[in-house]
Each structure stands twice: as C-alpha cells, then as structure tokens.
C-alpha cells in the first residue's frame, strides 16, 4: 500500500550535469543546459516528485510527474521508461507499482541519488547515451557504484 | 537454504579446456547472479566474472575475457565455467558463488556473495 | 580498475586480543564493500556487508566500519576459531577486485 503524502518541484541531473526534460515527443532526455536555459525550458524541467508512505518501509516511494499541457506521470511498465498522461494517484492498494520508485541516497553521498523501481527489484533509473541523445532508461544494474545510475534533485520550491 | 554444488576435480594437460559446472539446489530468488572466483596455491581470491541467468549476459575480468566462457542452462539451475588454454598457473580451486541484493534496514541495496559452491580442484600439469 | 590494498598481509595474535585488518580503495567506492573469512579447504564466507552490517549468523565480535576508500574490518576479542584468511572485496564496479588478503594466526 502507497499513500501520497506532499510533493516538491525537482530538477534531475545526471552526474554530467546535463539536465533531465521531457521533449516534444514525451520522451525524457538529458541534455547539457545552463541555468537560464533550465529556466526557458520550464516547465519540460521541472518534475513533480510526489511521496508516499510505503506500509513496508524500502526507502522514500516517489512517484515523478511533469505538467506540460496535462500531468504525465513516469512509469516503468514492461520495464520500459515512458510518460503516461496521469495524475499520481492518492492512494495504490499493491506493494509494487510501476509508477513508484524508491529514491535513495548513494552510500556517503547524500546529494547524489538512486531510483530503484519497485516493480522490479535490482532495476534503477539510468543515464544511457543512444546515438546522439542521452535518455533515461530503466536499467537492470549490479554495478551499484555506477554513475549512470546516480543523480542530483535540486528542489525548485 | 539455497546450496551450490560444483562438478569434481579436473587434472589437464597444458593448452586443454576444462568446464566446471555449479548446480543450485534450494529455493532461490530471482533478480541472482552467478560469479566464479578461483584461488590458486598460496595465492588470494580472484574474481573472474558473472553470468545473470536471466539474459546470459556476461562481464568478464581482463585477463580472462579471451579465455573465459560463462554459461548457464536454466532448465536445470547449472552454471558453467569453461576456461581454454589452460597453462599451469591455472592450477586453483574455483568457486561458483551467488551474487544477490541484501538489504539494509533503509531498504538500500547491497550486493553479496552469499552462497558458495565447494570448490573444484583444477591441477594443470603435463 | 578499483585496487582495493588490504592491510597487514599476515598477523599473529593471542586470544581476547583486539585485530584490525584495514583495506583501502584506489577510489570511493560507496560502501559497496565486503568481508569474506575462507579457512582451509573451505570456500569463503560471507561476514560483514554494506562495509558495516554483520551477516546473519556471524559474531558479534566482527565489526565492519569505514566509507569512501577506507574500510576496516575489527575482531574484538579473538578466538581460536577465527583463524584463517580473511578478504574485501569492493562491488561498486566491474571488474569487482578483492584485497590481497589477511592470514590470521593464534599464537
């Protein structure tokens, strides 16, 4: 059982430092922008995390949304990264949903930030660089010192 | 409780190949990984690499990639280990060892060698 | 590659002592570290994970502390079955590399 608690606006970078948006074709991309672009660029910028109390304590369970023209809401569904036009929901009566995602600190480093999905256990929110674009994919990954699968949150509020 | 049970020992010859297998007896979780690591006489442990059963994809150490097949039969919970051009310096034991998520009490992920074959004795001698 | 150089290579020590084995990362490896005991004619196992959360069944006499390169495994107060060669082994990144490994005496 997930339970929505309060939201922050975030911006997701990389640990390239290239930002994290979402494109004209809904697609989320990281791309090298500096701050006053990141701001143009609002609000494909600017994420929506939402978190939930989790009835089995696994980290902090987030939901990331984006409100372009509507809400879209990141989902790893068939372990495939895509944004579907949602709203996080108040409440989800499962332990596991594909839109949930536990956000943890990396070991030390309390700035930089992993997503394991909670649909699929060992799978995390990654960085991979396909031909000329860097997309955020789900990424089965037992390489946890992996910067791919690091990133930053700076809160927007 | 999950047990790893290897294949016997092997004596080669110089410039053969030998395959040594792990068999999962127990009930196991998936999201695993097998790793095969060897300790040869008066040395330390060696990591060679790991196969993830659920795609058979592989990462091999350097110095082994040319050598090194790792593959795994599902359908029987077998994992192998073939290693080619043997020369004497191959002469170790080899262990098959699980390689799974342990948790701490956060919830964040740790990865760990937790169950361990017996160890297979491979002398390479002409 | 990480090099993980594990300290001292050998110690002999006496019964109730206190033993430290230290290894040290070439570069931070993010707790991802474990400690491993092998005795003779047996395969390793597993002690401490996470750089500092003893495994299931092991002694509380075993501790794991340590983040970013440096990490330390204590034994503290030493008992005449805790002879036997003890291992990190950094998992942060491929190619996972263990220390060179403690040999552990009673004298």
């Known amino acids: 059982y997930f339970g929505k608690l309060e939201s922050k606006l975030s911006v997701i970078r990389n640990l390239n430092d290239q930002v994290l948006f979402i494109d004209q074709g809904n697609r989320p991309l990281f791309e090298d922008m500096t701050d006053s672009d990141c701001r143009d660029n609002a609000p494909r910028t600017i994420f929506i995390i939402s978190m939930y109390k989790d009835s089995q304590p696994r980290g902090m369970a987030v939901t990331i949304s984006v409100k372009c023209e509507k809400i879209s809401t990141l989902s790893c569904e068939n372990k495939i990264i895509s944004f579907k036009e949602m709203n996080p929901p108040d409440n989800i009566k499962d332990t596991k949903s594909d839109i949930i995602f536990f956000q943890r600190s990396v070991p030390g480093h309390d700035n930089k930030m992993q997503f394991e999905s909670s649909s699929y256990e060992g799978y995390f929110l990654a960085c991979e660089k396909e031909r000329d674009l860097f997309k955020l994919i789900l990424k089965k990954e037992d390489e946890l010192g992996d910067r791919s699968i690091m990133f930053t949150v700076q809160n927007e509020d | 409780q999950v047990q790893l049970v290897q294949s016997g020992a092997e004596v080669k010859k110089p410039g053969a190949s030998v395959k040594v297998s792990c068999k999962v007896s127990?009930?196991?979780?998936?999201?695993?990984?097998f790793h095969w690591v060897r300790r040869r006489p008066g040395k330390g442990l060696e990591w060679m690499g790991r196969i993830d059963p659920e795609d058979d994809s592989t990462k091999y150490a350097e110095r082994f990639k040319d050598r090194v097949t790792m593959t795994e039969d599902t359908s029987t919970d077998t994992a192998y280990m073939e290693l080619s051009s043997l020369r004497s310096e191959d002469t170790a034991v080899y262990y098959c060892t699980t390689w799974r998520i342990y948790r701490d009490s956060s919830g964040r992920p740790f990865y760990v060698m937790d169950a361990w074959g017996q160890g297979t004795l491979v002398t390479v001698s002409s | 590659d990480i090099q993980m150089t594990q300290s001292p290579s050998s110690v002999s020590a006496s019964v109730g002592d206190r033993v430290t084995i230290t290894c040290l990362a070439s570069?931070?490896?993010?707790?991802?570290l474990t400690w491993y005991q092998q005795k003779p004619g047996k395969a390793p196992q597993l002690l401490i994970y996470?750089?500092?959360k003893l495994q299931d069944g092991v002694p509380s006499r075993f501790s794991g502390s340590g983040s970013g390169t440096d990490y330390t495994l204590t034994i503290s107060s030493l008992q005449p079955e805790d002879e036997g060669d003890y291992y990190c082994?950094?998992?942060?990144?491929?190619?996972?590399?263990f220390g060179q490994g403690t040999k552990l005496e009673i004298k």
């Open positions: 996470g750089a500092n």
């Open positions: 127990g009930e196991i979780s998936t999201g695993y990984y």
């Open positions: 082994l950094q998992g942060s990144k491929f190619p996972l590399t």
């Open positions: 570069e931070d490896i993010y707790t991802y």
